[in-house]
């Protein structure tokens, strides 16, 4: 008879993680007597995957009934494949011997590659908020995919971004890979409702990419604009001064009225008017009894927004000679504007 040949017909096999991999092997002869074994890798460090002779291999089943003598098919199936199973598998015929069986002939090997889906991309933004016209960085991470080839794109409100840097690790061969990308985004005043999207395409996703999103509302701070005006009053001994706080984000805002530099009242914005662009407006007013003042009054609206340094706007309230003759206590109260005089985004 011709000398036994070990035939592994497939050079490579690709399997999705979680599926079973069939590794084919056939012998051309039954001689010599002895077991066949499957190994992953070659050389001294090779890993035994299946031994016809002995052992417990719960994930491995033989494709054919090996107890039939005329069987020359020594293919195996490995269940529940993970990326860690990737490698080159060798079907090896041994000759019965002692103290150990003697390797007689090996197949050429079959490379098993495992297609593993990337994890859902996680997008994270900056730790602190930034104001419009500033650049912030967003990161996108995904792990556990194989093979290494992967495509990552960034979008802002559907528009593809170009200012980003992407790394796939490790650089060399591995059972699975990770991707890390950092995108630089210039903020605009209208970005409260904006989203950045990290989109990942991979062979395992069959054309249906994975997306991770982050809201720019978590990254942006739009400082308010202030406008202090005097409203007309019927009673000539009262002045109504309003402070219109416009187009700010996020909500957190504290307003303080000062009369000639002295704190008159502090209040925290509660019921806000939301603009279409996601920013907020708020109005506070101060009723001033002009009779109580002998001289002109400087009224200051001071706003502390989102824990930042206060901004202020002052208004000089002129006291007429007639009003200066009558002395009276100052009265003031705050009220919410029934409408937002300033709408839209700047």
């Amino acid at each position: 008879e011709d000398e036994l040949q070990v035939i592994q017909p497939e050079k490579s096999v690709s399997v999705a993680a979680g599926e079973s991999a069939t590794l084919r092997c056939a012998m051309t002869s039954l001689i010599p007597v002895g077991p066949i074994m499957w190994f992953r890798g070659a050389g001294a460090g090779r890993e035994l995957i299946y031994n016809q002779k002995e052992g417990h291999f719960p994930r491995v089943t033989t494709v054919s009934e090996l107890t039939k003598r005329n069987n020359l098919d020594f293919s195996i199936s490995i269940s529940n494949i993970t990326p860690a199973d990737a490698g080159t598998y060798y079907c090896v015929k041994f000759r019965k011997g002692s103290p150990d069986d003697v390797e007689f002939k090996s197949g050429a090997g079959t490379e098993l590659s495992v297609r593993a889906k990337p994890s859902a991309p996680v997008v994270s933004g900056p730790a602190v908020r930034a104001t419009p016209e500033h650049t912030v960085s967003f990161t996108c991470e995904s792990h556990g995919f194989s093979p290494r080839d992967i495509t990552l794109k960034w979008f802002k409100n559907g528009n593809e971004l170009s200012d980003f840097q992407t790394n796939v690790d490790p650089a060399g061969d591995s059972v699975s890979y990770s991707i890390h990308s950092t995108a630089r985004v210039v903020l605009t005043r209208g970005d409260v409702h904006s989203q950045v999207i990290c989109e990942i395409a991979h062979i395992t996703l069959q054309g249906d990419p994975l997306r991770g999103t982050a809201n720019l509302s978590e990254a942006i701070r739009v400082p308010p604009t202030l406008e202090v005006t005097q409203q007309p009053m019927r009673a000539e001994n009262q002045a109504n001064v309003t402070c219109q706080v416009s187009n700010f984000y996020p909500r957190g805002l504290q307003l303080t009225w000062l009369e000639n530099g002295n704190v008159s009242r502090t209040e925290t914005a509660s019921t806000l008017i939301e603009n279409k662009d996601g920013t907020y407006n708020w109005m506070s007013w101060l009723l001033v009894n002009t009779c109580a003042h002998r001289d002109d009054v400087v009224l200051t609206c001071q706003v502390e927004h989102d824990g930042q340094q206060a901004v202020s706007k002052s208004y000089a309230l002129e006291i007429s000679a007639h009003q200066k003759e009558h002395g009276s206590d100052i009265t003031h109260e705050a009220a919410l504007a029934p409408t937002a005089p300033l709408g839209g985004s700047g």
Partner: antibody, heavy 118, light 107 residues
Framework: EVQLVESGGGLVQPGGSLRLSCAAS????????MHWVRQAPGKGLEWVSA???????YYTGSVKGRFTISRENAKNSLYLQMNSLRASDTAVYYC????????????WGQGTMVTVSS | DIQMTQSPSSLSASVGDRVTITCRAS??????LAWFQQKPGKAPKSLIY???SLHSGVPSKFSGSGSGTDFTLTISSLQPEDFATYYC?????????FGQGTKLEIK
């Protein structure tokens, strides 16, 4: 059903000859290594001879040159030609099938008695 | 030739007992060791191959272990049908050789 049935045993004088047969059923005999094992009365088991799937033959020292193992694929049968028989060859002779990949004995015939006596 | 030595040659035990028979090879035989059971007037029956693998249909009360030169056959709970003679055999190289047998008798 896988089965081995031996025949051809009997009483023979020292120096005589005998041909044992083993008819296999339920499997193809030529696909297996086949063996003859004997057991002298009141004694243990002794391996006698084997024939491999390639026709290679093996014998224990005491029968070498006197016994010949062979098979006939068309009849799915195994044979043991015994010449120059001695009293020490008296035994029950069993036909045995070797296992699939390691030649471990798995199927035994019921045996046939060979008596060498004058 | 490889010599196979069994011990003990005979053994008396009771139903329900756990018994162990040992077999020693004169040289390393890897794990190409088989065990057979034979009852008077009957052909041997194959129990175990490659030291620890049970042949089809053999009850799990039979177990084998060992590698190299020292091997054991254990019967976990003796039943009346288990009283017989047991043989070990090496089949790593020709000539295949058997142990002299261990006769297991009812006490």
């Amino acid at each position: 059903e896988v089965q081995l049935v031996e025949s051809g045993g009997g009483l023979v004088q020292p120096g005589g000859s005998l041909r044992l047969s083993c008819a296999a059923s339920g499997f193809t005999l030529s696909s297996y290594d086949m063996h003859w094992v004997r057991q002298a009365p009141g004694k243990g088991l002794e391996w006698v001879s084997a024939i491999g799937t390639a026709g290679d033959t093996y014998y224990t020292g005491s029968v070498k040159g006197r016994f010949t193992i062979s098979r006939e694929n068309a009849k799915n049968s195994l044979y043991l030609q015994m010449n120059s028989l001695r009293a020490s060859d008296t035994a029950v002779y069993y036909c045995v099938r070797g296992g699939v990949w390691d030649d471990a004995f798995d199927i035994w015939g019921q045996g046939t008695m060979v008596t060498v006596s004058s | 030739d490889i010599q196979m030595t069994q011990s003990p040659s005979s053994l008396s035990a009771s139903v329900g007992d756990r018994v162990t028979i040992t077999c020693r090879a004169s040289q390393d035989i890897n794990n190409y060791l088989a065990w057979f059971q034979q009852k008077p007037g009957k052909a041997p029956k194959s129990l175990i191959y490659t030291a620890s693998s049970l042949h089809s249909g053999v009850p799990s009360k039979f177990s084998g272990s060992g590698s190299g030169t020292d091997f054991t056959l254990t019967i976990s709970s003796l039943q009346p049908e288990d009283f017989a003679t047991y043989y070990c055999q090496q089949y790593v190289s020709y000539p295949y050789t058997f142990g002299q047998g261990t006769k297991l008798e009812i006490k």
